[in-house]
């Protein structure tokens, strides 16, 4: 079953390569277990950036080596992606799945265009 997912159209990463955005889903029921996946689309290729499954009311737990962190509040997920460089500029799509209890619902956002600008190197000082 389809579910609406909203996310910002554009986000500019910080000079330290950190980008944050909110992914909000219109839950048709009271899910207890939710999975959030961030997908990156660039040059018609879609790759999974990170994913987390969480129990409602608990923190999102990404893998230890994940570049993502996040928190949840109601039907909102606050996602932060770290370690971004200019080459990582692209469309980041939020996919939300309500896993349990049934029925299974899937929602895919339109994507957030994240722009990353590598910082200029500091000039050498004598």
């Amino acid at each position: 079953k389809a579910m609406h997912v909203a996310q910002p159209a554009v986000v500019l990463a910080s000079s330290r390569g950190i980008a944050s955005f909110v992914c909000e889903y219109a839950s048709p029921g009271k899910a207890t277990e939710v999975r959030v996946t961030v997908l990156r689309q660039a040059d018609s290729q879609v790759t999974e950036v990170c994913a987390a499954t969480y129990m409602m009311g608990n923190e999102l737990t990404f893998l230890d080596d994940s570049i993502c962190t996040g928190t949840s509040s109601g039907n909102q997920v606050n996602l932060t992606i770290q370690g971004l460089r200019a080459m990582d500029t692209g469309l980041y799509i939020c996919k939300v799945e309500l896993m349990y209890p049934p029925p299974y619902y899937l929602g895919i956002g339109n994507g957030t265009q994240i722009y990353v600008i590598d910082p200029e190197p500091c000039p050498d000082s004598d």
Partner: antibody, heavy 119, light 111 residues
Framework: QVQLVQSGAEVKKPGSSVKVSCKAS??????????VAWIRQAPGQGLEWIGQ???????YYNPSLKSRVTITADKSTSTAYMELSSLRSEDTAVYYC???????????WGQGTLVTVSS | DIQLTQSPSSLSASVGDRVTITCRAS??????????LDWYQQKPGKAPKLLIY???SLESGVPSRFSGSGSGTDFTLTISSLQPEDFATYYC?????????FGQGTKVEIK
């Protein structure tokens, strides 16, 4: 008609891996709400849910087997796969694939694949 | 994990008998008016067959002598008039919470 056809019986050594296939016909693995689940049954025992793959491509596993199992699907051939690694004798079982509804009940089953793990 | 306990583990009955199998869950499997509890029949050497889903809905093609009832933690599968082809093992299954779990089975044998 709607059916799932599984690959043939396998005999494996402890520590090795096995990959079982399940070809769907009469329905699409891309249909909304559809998932393919894998369930096993040891000789003379009950049923154990292994995990499932959703039409979205997401997978979900039983924590008791998560570290050793990988479920994949090739939508172009309507085939789902279940790979189990680091096999041990207690993995000897009939492995079934089944179509899962959005409510996670299993309304169509494959014929089963016997996997025997023996040295 | 949600544990499902079936009783009895086995029973002997005759053709025409009314048979009742119970399934008790370790916690409620109800959500928004639906009980996520299903029943399957399995014959030796064959895959399980779905009989009842969502506690009381009869799967298409399943004879009306099979019925399911219950909510919360206590569920029942009833065969109103046992037929020769009904001798098999019956399993309940919950899908309310991961991992999906099954009862240990109830074997219905000929008396």
């Amino acid at each position: 008609q709607v059916q799932l056809v599984q690959s043939g019986a396998e005999v494996k050594k402890p520590g090795s891996s096995v990959k079982v296939s399940c070809k769907a016909s009469g329905f699409s693995l891309s249909t909304g709400g559809v998932a393919v689940a894998w369930i096993r049954q040891a000789p003379g025992q009950g049923l154990e849910w292994i995990g499932q793959i959703y039409y979205s491509g997401s997978t979900y596993y039983n924590p008791s087997l998560k570290s050793r199992v990988t479920i994949t699907a090739d939508k172009s051939t309507s085939t789902a796969y279940m790979e189990l690694s680091s096999l041990r004798s207690e993995d000897t079982a009939v492995y079934y694939c089944a179509r899962s509804s959005a409510h996670y009940y299993f309304d169509v089953w494959g014929q089963g694949t016997l996997v025997t793990v023996s040295s | 994990d949600i544990q499902l306990t079936q009783s009895p583990s086995s029973l002997s009955a005759s053709v025409g008998d009314r048979v009742t199998i119970t399934c008790r869950a370790s916690e409620s499997v109800d959500f928004q008016g639906i009980s996520f509890l299903d029943w399957y029949q399995q014959k030796p050497g064959k895959a399980p067959k779905l009989l009842i889903y969502d506690a009381s809905s009869l799967e298409s093609g399943v004879p009306s002598r099979f019925s399911g009832s219950g909510s919360g933690t206590d569920f029942t599968l009833t065969i109103s008039s046992l037929q020769p082809e009904d001798f098999a093992t019956y399993y309940c299954q919950q899908s309310y919470r991961s991992p999906i779990t099954f009862g240990q089975g109830t074997k219905v044998e000929i008396k």
